[in-house]
C-alpha cells in the first residue's frame, strides 16, 4: 500500500521474546495464514471468477454496440479496466498464499500491483465522464442532440485512460522488491525510504483525486439529476441512471477501507503498533477494493432482472438491454412531440 507493507508470518516467537529451547529445530517457513489473509484469498478467488467471466461477457456484449451506442462505450471501457485488474489476481493470490513472498521479480512487482490503482483511477475518471454525460442529457438536451456522439465519447475515454496512467506513475516508480534477511523472504511493496513527505503526498493525492473530489462532484451531480428526474420526470433513461448510481455507490463503498488505511499508514511510523495492525489488514483492504472489478457485471445482471421481471432472456441479451439502452430526453414543457421523435431517431442512431 503506502510503505513497505507486507508483514511476516508468525515468526514472532523468534523475536522479542525469551530464548527458546536451543535444541528445537527451527521452522524457517510458517504454515499458518492470518485470518485477514484467508478472507482476502477467498475474496480474490471470487472476484477473479466473477470478474473475468462477467467482464469478458460485458466486453463481448458492448463491443458490438460501441460503434453506435454511447452507453455501450462507457460500459465497455469500465469492463476493460476491471478485466485488466482481474488478470493480476492469480499472482497476488499466489503471493499471499506464500505469506507475501514475491518470487515474480522486480518488473512484475512494479506492474501487477499497480493495475489495481490504474483500475481505480480509470474507473473513477470513467464514472465521472459517464456522470457528466448523464448530467448533460438531463440539463443540456439540445447540446447533446447536436454534439453528443460516439467520437466524442471515445475521446473522453482516451483522456480518462491517459490521466489514469499518469496518476498511477508514482506508485509504479516507488514499487520495489526487498529481500529480507530473516525470515528469508522477498517482498514487493512501496518504498519511499528517506522521503516520508513524498509518501504522504502520494497518499493525499490518491485520496483526494481518487476518492474525495470524485465523491463530492458525483454526489452533487447525481443530487441534481435525481432532483430533476423526480420533480419533472424529465428523462426516460431511469434504468441507466439507476445502474450508474449503483456503480458509483459501490465504487466508494469498496475503496473506502483502502483509502482510509492508506492515508493513516502514511502518517504513522512503520514500527508503531497501529501501523503494524493496519499492515496486517492491508491484503484484506486491497481485496475489498478489488470487489469493484467484479461488482459491475453483477449490478448489470441484477438491474436487468429487475427490468425483465424475472430472468426470461439469455444473459447476453439481458446485459445488452441494460448496457446499450440509449438515453432520450423527454421534457414536455420544453419540446414538442415532433422534436422528441426527431431526437429519438437521432440518438438511437448514435
Amino acid at each position: 500500500m503506502n510503505s513497505f507493507n507486507y508483514t511476516t508470518p508468525d515468526y514472532g516467537h523468534y523475536d522479542d521474546k525469551d530464548t527458546l529451547d536451543l535444541n528445537t529445530p527451527v521452522d524457517k517457513t510458517s504454515n499458518t495464514l492470518r485470518v485477514p489473509d484467508i478472507l482476502a484469498l477467498v475474496i480474490f478467488a471470487v472476484v477473479f471468477l466473477v470478474g473475468v467471466l462477467g467482464n469478458a461477457l460485458v466486453v463481448w456484449v458492448t463491443a458490438f454496440e460501441a460503434k453506435r451506442t454511447i452507453n455501450a462505450i462507457w460500459f465497455l471501457n469500465l469492463a476493460v479496466a476491471d478485466f485488466l485488474s482481474c488478470l493480476a489476481l492469480p499472482i497476488l493470490f499466489t503471493s499471499i498464499v506464500q505469506h507475501h513472498h514475491w518470487p515474480f521479480g522486480g518488473a512484475a512487482c512494479s506492474i501487477l500491483p499497480s493495475l489495481i490503482l490504474l483500475n481505480m483511477y480509470a474507473s473513477i475518471l470513467l464514472l465521472a465522464t459517464i456522470s457528466a454525460d448523464r448530467f448533460l442529457l438531463v440539463f443540456k438536451p439540445i447540446w447533446c442532440q447536436n454534439f453528443r456522439g460516439a467520437g466524442l465519447a471515445w475521446i473522453a475515454c482516451a483522456v480518462a485512460w491517459g490521466l489514469a496512467l499518469l496518476l498511477t506513475i508514482p506508485s509504479f516508480l516507488y514499487r520495489v522488491v526487498r529481500e529480507e534477511y530473516f525470515p528469508p523472504k522477498v517482498l514487493c511493496g512501496v518504498d519511499y525510504s528517506h522521503d516520508k513527505r513524498r509518501e504522504r503526498a502520494v497518499a493525499i493525492v490518491r485520496l483526494v483525486l481518487g476518492f474525495l473530489w470524485p465523491l463530492l462532484t458525483l454526489t452533487i451531480c447525481y443530487t441534481f439529476i435525481l432532483l430533476r428526474t423526480w420533480s419533472r420526470r424529465a428523462t426516460r433513461s431511469t434504468k441507466t441512471l439507476k445502474v450508474v448510481v449503483a456503480v458509483v455507490a459501490s465504487f466508494f463503498i469498496f475503496w473506502l477501507p483502502y483509502q482510509v488505511t492508506g492515508i493513516m499508514m502514511s502518517f504513522l511510523e512503520p514500527s508503531s503498533p497501529t501501523f503494524l495492525l493496519l499492515n496486517k489488514l492491508d491484503s484484506l483492504c486491497v481485496s475489498f477494493a478489488y470487489i469493484n472489478c467484479c461488482i459491475n457485471p453483477i449490478i448489470y445482471v441484477v438491474a436487468g432482472q429487475g427490468f425483465q421481471g424475472r430472468l426470461r432472456k439469455s444473459l447476453p441479451s439481458l446485459l445488452r438491454n441494460v448496457l446499450t439502452e440509449e438515453s432520450v430526453v423527454r421534457e414536455s414543457k420544453s419540446f414538442t412531440r415532433s422534436t422528441v421523435d426527431t431526437m429519438a431517431q437521432k440518438t438511437q442512431a448514435v
Partner: antibody, heavy 121, light 112 residues
C-alpha cells in the same frame, strides 16, 4: 560459552581455490545461520553469504557470482566456505559469524577469530 | 544493496568525554515485522568484531551502559557517554534487515 574456531592462514596463487573451516561449540549449531564476512586490508566488512546447517539452505551475495560455496557438516558442527578463481583483491581476513535464529538478539552476535587469505603470484 | 554511510570516519576523543557516531542507510531498515535490524560493532585492534548494540538500542550482554544507540528508519546514532581507553577501535554499523547484509565503512575512535 559460544566459540567459533577457524582454520589457519592460507597463501594461494591467482586462479586457485581456498576452503576455510569454522568449528562451532557452546550452542546448538543447527539453530543458527552461519555467515561468512570478509575484510580486505584497511577496508570495511563485506558479507559473502550464509548457510542454515539444519537443511543446507544457502544464500549468497550476488557480488561473488557463483565463486563462493558455503557448506556445513552437522555431525562435527563445522561450517566451510570455499572461494574459487581467486584474484589478488580476494586477499583479506575471512570471518565466520553466527546469527542465532531463536534468540532475542536477531543479529550476527559471535565471530570467529578470522582466517587470513593471501593471494599472490 | 543497502549502503550504510558512517560519519565521522575518524573520531579523536579525550578520555572521559562523550562521543557520538552517526550512521545513515540508503533505504529504510524497518522490517515488515516492525523491527529495525540496525546493529553496532566494535573491532578492537587485531581482534574480531564484537557486538555492542543490536536492533538500534539494545545493549548486548556484557556491554557497559555508557554505550547507547538510538534512531529510526534511516538515521541512527551510537553514543558513548564517557570514553574509556578500552573503547579504542573501529566502530561499524550494520543492517540485517535486508539481503545482502551490509556494513558501514567504519569510524576509528582514538584517544587525543
Amino acid at each position: 560459552q559460544v566459540q567459533l574456531v577457524q582454520s589457519g592462514a592460507e597463501v594461494k596463487k591467482p586462479g586457485a581455490s581456498v576452503k576455510i573451516s569454522c568449528k562451532a561449540s557452546g550452542y546448538a549449531f543447527s539453530n543458527s545461520w552461519m555467515n561468512w564476512v570478509r575484510q580486505a586490508p584497511g577496508k570495511g566488512l563485506e558479507w559473502m553469504g550464509r548457510i542454515y546447517p539444519g537443511d543446507g539452505d544457502t544464500k549468497y551475495n550476488g557480488k561473488f557470482k557463483g565463486r563462493v560455496t558455503i557448506t556445513a557438516d552437522e555431525s562435527t558442527s563445522t561450517a566451510y566456505m570455499e572461494l574459487s578463481s581467486l584474484r589478488s583483491e580476494d586477499s583479506a581476513v575471512y570471518f565466520c559469524a553466527r546469527f542465532l535464529l531463536i534468540s532475542t538478539v536477531t543479529a550476527v552476535d559471535y565471530w570467529g577469530q578470522g582466517t587470513t587469505v593471501t593471494v599472490s603470484s | 544493496d543497502v549502503v550504510m554511510t558512517q560519519s565521522p570516519l575518524s573520531l579523536p576523543v579525550t578520555l572521559g568525554e562523550p562521543a557520538s557516531i552517526s550512521c545513515r542507510s540508503s533505504q529504510s531498515l524497518v522490517h515488515s515485522n516492525g523491527n529495525t535490524y540496525l546493529h553496532w560493532y566494535l573491532q578492537k585492534p587485531g581482534q574480531s568484531p564484537q557486538l555492542l548494540i543490536y536492533k538500534v538500542s539494545n545493549r548486548f550482554s556484557g556491554v557497559p551502559d555508557r554505550f547507547s544507540g538510538s534512531g529510526s528508519g534511516t538515521d541512527f546514532t551510537l553514543k558513548i557517554s564517557r570514553v574509556e581507553a578500552e573503547d579504542v577501535g573501529v566502530y561499524f554499523c550494520s543492517q540485517s534487515t535486508l539481503v545482502p547484509l551490509t556494513f558501514g565503512q567504519g569510524t576509528k575512535l582514538e584517544i587525543k
